[in-house]
């Protein structure tokens, strides 16, 4: 097999996944744009494997090679960037592991996150020793151009020294680059000789260009940025939760749903219910009550679990996480069964897969 | 039964606007989503979107989007669709159907259809 | 030009068994279920197989849906006279991020 690597990121925490409104965070893979990558589907006995990017189904191609577990993509682009799933389908049931490729380095210029040698890039000189600006860091500074998810974030580095200091400002497409120019505005850090702009959208396409000046001379460094859509769609919920589970009358029990999506999703917990020993009406739709909804004083985290307290028999049935965002809608559905206590002891038997 | 009943038939001028409802009778209104086909003469399906009242959001087709407006009124179990800056194309029937999301965006029921037509 | 494919027409003798198709791609068929509906002449849809092969009441069991990879089929068996009309498969697309019909089947009963 052809060894392709992907270095799973753990470091990049302040980096936020493309996905904009994604409640649950799955893992995210980063690579450059032109590295061959590869990721392996991390679901046990998996007995036929299917890949899905963003919701729509994923099958080989002159670059995307689907071979066992593994899902290799060569030269990758901004493009390939997205939320992707592996389904192990097995005999009884199906899993599904979701993750984040993003293609970008998204800290751009060489950077990380936190700065950490920033102050080496500020170079104190001898008063007595005039100089004109120079690059103190080019490796910084090599990737010109920087192909970038919607909604990421981005770093432009032009770290110099000179004496006297120099100071930097930005340009962009050839002019003054003023915070106005862009919702949100952008920093400047003169420390660590940097650009940052936040949730970058289309319209910051452009070309960006340092100006580093003294009194003795000046020096410029212009960067490409190319922002890269990611194509939105309704909410994908995990797949296997929420799952199926029993408890003894008196126990607890709850339902996870995990839930991404690009727009802001609305999510509500329906119970299918019976209305006079019946669970249709008489249009033949079945009777749903809305048992939690997302609203001012539920956060995200809190409308991912149900819980259901001091268990009854009148709570078993059909419990379903209903998601909807404005591209569409997503569902899916568990069962509770509800046992007779034992005695007087309270007993509960839940699968691990969906108890936290 | 829970039955779809339409408002009539509507004859508009090329740049107009036309509204045309729908009413839900005998049955559940909030709990599904009310979809809006088309079909012009001859022709066949055209799904233009939806509001889904459970969570007070409406989805478009891409084709119709800035053009169209599906709103829905819960208290009389009225739903509406809008159709802006008309053109002779947009001659056609339109049809409004509850989308059973559990049905995976099944239209289980239709209403009766509402002859819109463009001519100057 | 519509995103499903289906023959525009299809034909039987009554008592027949007659297959009408459904082509889509990844994005529609290959992703998400199908539903199929039945135009009689001069009247409004109606829903005949939904969620690729579930009938809802009152659709005789004489039809039936399947589905596999990014194309779908409907079938009619015992074709009887009453099925002349047009026939349209539907699923939503993650492409277009909306439902997308076939452009229709006519079945003619000879």
């Known amino acids: 097999r052809p060894s392709f690597s992907l270095v799973e990121d753990t470091t990049l925490e302040p980096e936020e996944p493309p996905t904009k409104y994604q409640i649950s965070q799955p893992e995210v893979y980063v690579a450059a744009p032109g590295e061959s990558l590869e990721v392996r589907c991390l679901l046990k006995d998996a007995a036929v494997i299917s890949w899905t990017k963003d919701g729509v189904h994923l099958g080989p191609n002159n670059r995307t090679v689907l071979i066992g577990e593994y899902l290799q993509i060569k030269g990758a682009t901004p493009r390939d960037s997205g939320l992707y799933a592996c389904t192990a389908s097995r005999t009884v049931d199906s899993e599904t592991w979701y993750f984040m490729v993003n293609v970008t380095d998204a800290i751009s210029s060489g950077d990380d996150e936190d700065d950490t040698d920033g102050a080496e890039d500020f170079v104190s000189e001898n008063s007595n020793n005039k100089r004109a600006p120079y690059w103190t860091n080019t490796e910084k500074m090599e990737k010109r151009l920087h192909a970038v998810p919607a909604a990421n974030t981005v770093k432009f580095r032009c770290p110099a020294g000179g004496n006297p200091m120099p100071t930097m400002r930005w340009l962009k497409n050839g002019k003054e680059f003023k915070q106005e120019h862009r919702i949100g505005g952008y920093k400047v850090r003169n420390q660590h000789w940097s650009l940052i702009m936040e949730s970058v959208v289309p319209s910051d396409k452009g070309n960006y260009t340092c100006v580093v000046e003294n009194e003795y001379g000046s020096i410029n460094h212009t960067y490409h940025l190319d922002v890269v859509e990611r194509s939105p769609h309704r909410p994908i919920l995990q797949a296997g939760l929420p799952a199926n589970a029993s408890t003894v009358v008196g126990g607890d029990v709850e339902f996870v749903c995990k839930v991404y999506s690009d727009a802001q999703p609305h999510i509500q917990w329906i119970k299918h219910v019976e209305k006079n020993g019946s669970k249709y009406g008489p249009d033949g739709l079945p009777y749903l009550k809305v048992l939690k909804a997302a609203g001012v004083n539920t956060t995200d985290k809190e409308i991912e679990v149900l819980y259901i307290r001091n268990v009854t028999f009148e709570d078993a049935g059909e419990y379903t996480c209903l998601a909807g965002n404005s591209i569409g809608i997503s569902f899916h559905s568990a069962w509770l069964t509800v046992l007779p206590a034992p005695g007087r002891e309270k007993e509960i038997t839940a699968s691990p897969d969906y108890l936290e | 039964q829970v039955q779809l009943v339409q408002s009539g038939a509507e004859v508009k001028k090329p740049g107009s606007s036309v509204k045309v409802s729908c009413k839900a009778s005998?049955?559940?209104?909030?709990?599904?989503?009310i979809s809006w086909v088309r079909q012009a003469p001859g022709q066949g399906l055209e799904w233009m979107g939806r509001?889904?009242?459970?969570?007070?959001?409406?989805n478009y087709a891409q084709k119709f989007q800035g053009r169209v407006t599906i709103t829905a009124d819960e208290s009389t179990s009225t739903a509406y669709m809008e159709l802006n800056s008309l053109r002779s194309e947009d001659t056609a029937v339109y049809y409004c159907?509850?989308?059973?999301?559990?049905?995976?965006?099944?239209?289980?029921?239709w209403g009766q259809g509402t002859m819109v037509t463009v001519s100057s | 030009q519509s995103v499903l494919t289906q023959p525009p027409s299809a034909s039987g003798t009554p008592g027949q068994r007659v297959t009408i198709s459904c082509s889509g791609s990844?994005?529609?068929?290959?992703?998400?279920?199908v539903n199929w509906y039945q135009q009689l002449p001069g009247t409004a849809p109606k829903l005949l197989i939904y969620?690729?092969?579930q009938r809802p009441s009152g659709v005789p069991d004489r039809f039936s849906g399947s589905k596999s990879g990014t194309s779908a089929s409907l079938a009619i068996s015992g074709l009887q006279s009453e099925d002349e009309a047009d026939y349209y498969c539907a699923a939503w697309d993650d492409s277009l991020n909306g439902v997308v019909f076939g452009g229709g089947t006519k079945l003619t009963v000879l």
């Open positions: 509001i889904i009242p459970i969570f007070g959001t409406a």
């Open positions: 159907a509850r989308d059973r999301w559990d049905w995976n965006d099944a239209f289980d029921i």
């Open positions: 969620s690729n092969n």
């Open positions: 990844s994005s529609n068929i290959g992703s998400n279920t």
């Open positions: 005998g049955g559940t209104f909030s709990s599904y989503a």
